[in-house]
Amino acid sequence: GSEGETFFQKPESCPPVPGGSMKLDIGIINENQRVSMSRNIESRSTSPWDYTVTWDPNRYPSEVVQAQCRNLGCINAQGKEDISMNSVPIQQETLVVRRKHQGSSVSFQLEKVLVTVGCTCVTPVIHHVQ
Amino acid sequence: NFPRTVMVNLNIHNRNTNTNPKRSSDYYDRSTSPWNLHRNEDPERYPSVIWEAKCRHLGCINADGNVDYHMNSVPIQQEILVLRREPPHCPNSFRLEKILVSVGCTCVTPIVHHVA
C-alpha cells in the first residue's frame, strides 16, 4: 500500500489535523479504576519492593511511580534472604505526554515509558562459566 | 497545567521498545507465582495489543515444584495510559484512557485465611 495508508476508513466526522501531528484530548477516560491500594503486597511478597516517585512538571502525568526490588534473593519462610532464588523486576510500558519548550514555542510529544511495577521471585538461570 | 486538548507530534518517542513480554523474558514461567499471558487486542486503541497476566495458581510453587497453599499468588496491577480513537475510527484523533492491567504475579504471605 501507499505510504500513510491507514487500516481505518476515515469517517467524514474526523476533525481536521495538521500533517505530522495528531489531536489528543488529555481528559482521561476511566479516571476511577477499580484498584486496591491497601493490599501492601510490596512488603508481603517473597520478592519485596520499594517505591520511588519521580515528578516532572513537563510530563503528563507529572508523577510516575517506579518499583525497586529490595533484595537480590527472595525471602524464605523464616524471613531470611535465600540467594538460591532471584528477585526480579516486572516491567510495563505506559504512555506519557511530554511538553517541550523551544524558545517561545511549545510542542507536545508522546513518549513510551517503561515502568517497573513490582517484583517476582524466580528460579535462577545458571550460567556455567567456561 | 496542561491544556485539555493538544496537538501532538505523530512520532512516538521510544516507540520501538520490545512490547511482547513473552519475548523479553521468561519470568512468567520461572516465577514461584507463574502466570500465563493473554493477548488483548483492540484496533481502536494504541497500543492495539496489550498482554494481560493471569496467575496460574492460587498458591505458589515450592522448591519441590508443588503448589504450596500457605502462600498466595497475586496479580501485580498497574494503571497505564493508552490512546483511544475519538471519534471512533479516526486515524489521527485520540483521547487518553486509563486502563488497569495485570502485569505479572508475585507470591505473598497470606493475610486472608480462607483455607484451613
Epitope: R34, S36, R39, I41 | N36, H38, E52, K54, C55, R56, H57, L58, G59, V67, Y69, N72, S73, V74, P75, V108, P110, I111, V112, H114, V115
Partner: nanobody
Framework: QVQLVESGGGLVQVGGSLRLSCEVS????????MGWFRQAPEKEREFVAA????????RYAHFVKGRFTISRDNAKNTVHLQMDSLKPEDTAVYYC????????????????WGLGTQVTVSS
C-alpha cells in the same frame, strides 16, 4: 455494571446433591479467580470455594472439602458449584463473586454481590 445471578438452590434431603450456577455479566470470568461464598442466618458471610484464573487449580474451605466441586465455563461466563453429600449445616444463601486477588481477596473489598440462591438441607 457487573451483575452476578446465582441459581440452582432449593430444598434437598441430607446426603442429597445440588448444582449451583452463577452467570456473570459485565466481567469476563476468565479474567479473575472466581469464588463461592455462603451466609447462614445470624452468621457472617464465609468463603466456600475458589478456582484459579486459568481454571486448573481450586481450593475449598475445610468444611466442604471432598464434598463440593467448583468449576468454570469461560465460554458461557459461568461458574458452577457441585454440592454432594449435603448436611444440615450447609443451609445458607450461596453467592458467587470474582476474586481479583485470588485467595488474597478480602471480604471488605467487594463493591457488589448478587442476590444469592437459597440452599436448604432438611434432615
Amino acid at each position: 455494571q457487573v451483575q452476578l445471578v446465582e441459581s440452582g438452590g432449593g430444598l434437598v434431603q441430607v446426603g442429597g446433591s445440588l448444582r449451583l450456577s452463577c452467570e456473570v455479566s459485565g466481567l469476563p470470568v476468565s479474567s479473575y479467580a472466581m469464588g463461592w461464598f455462603r451466609q447462614a442466618p445470624e452468621k457472617e458471610r464465609e468463603f466456600v470455594a475458589a478456582i484459579s484464573w486459568i481454571g486448573g487449580d481450586s481450593r475449598y474451605a475445610h468444611f466442604v472439602k471432598g464434598r463440593f466441586t467448583i468449576s468454570r465455563d469461560n465460554a458461557k461466563n459461568t461458574v458452577h458449584l457441585q454440592m454432594d453429600s449435603l448436611k444440615p449445616e450447609d443451609t445458607a444463601v450461596y453467592y458467587c463473586n470474582d476474586m481479583p486477588y485470588g485467595l488474597d481477596t478480602r471480604m471488605d473489598e467487594y463493591e457488589y454481590w448478587g442476590l444469592g440462591t437459597q440452599v436448604t438441607v432438611s434432615s
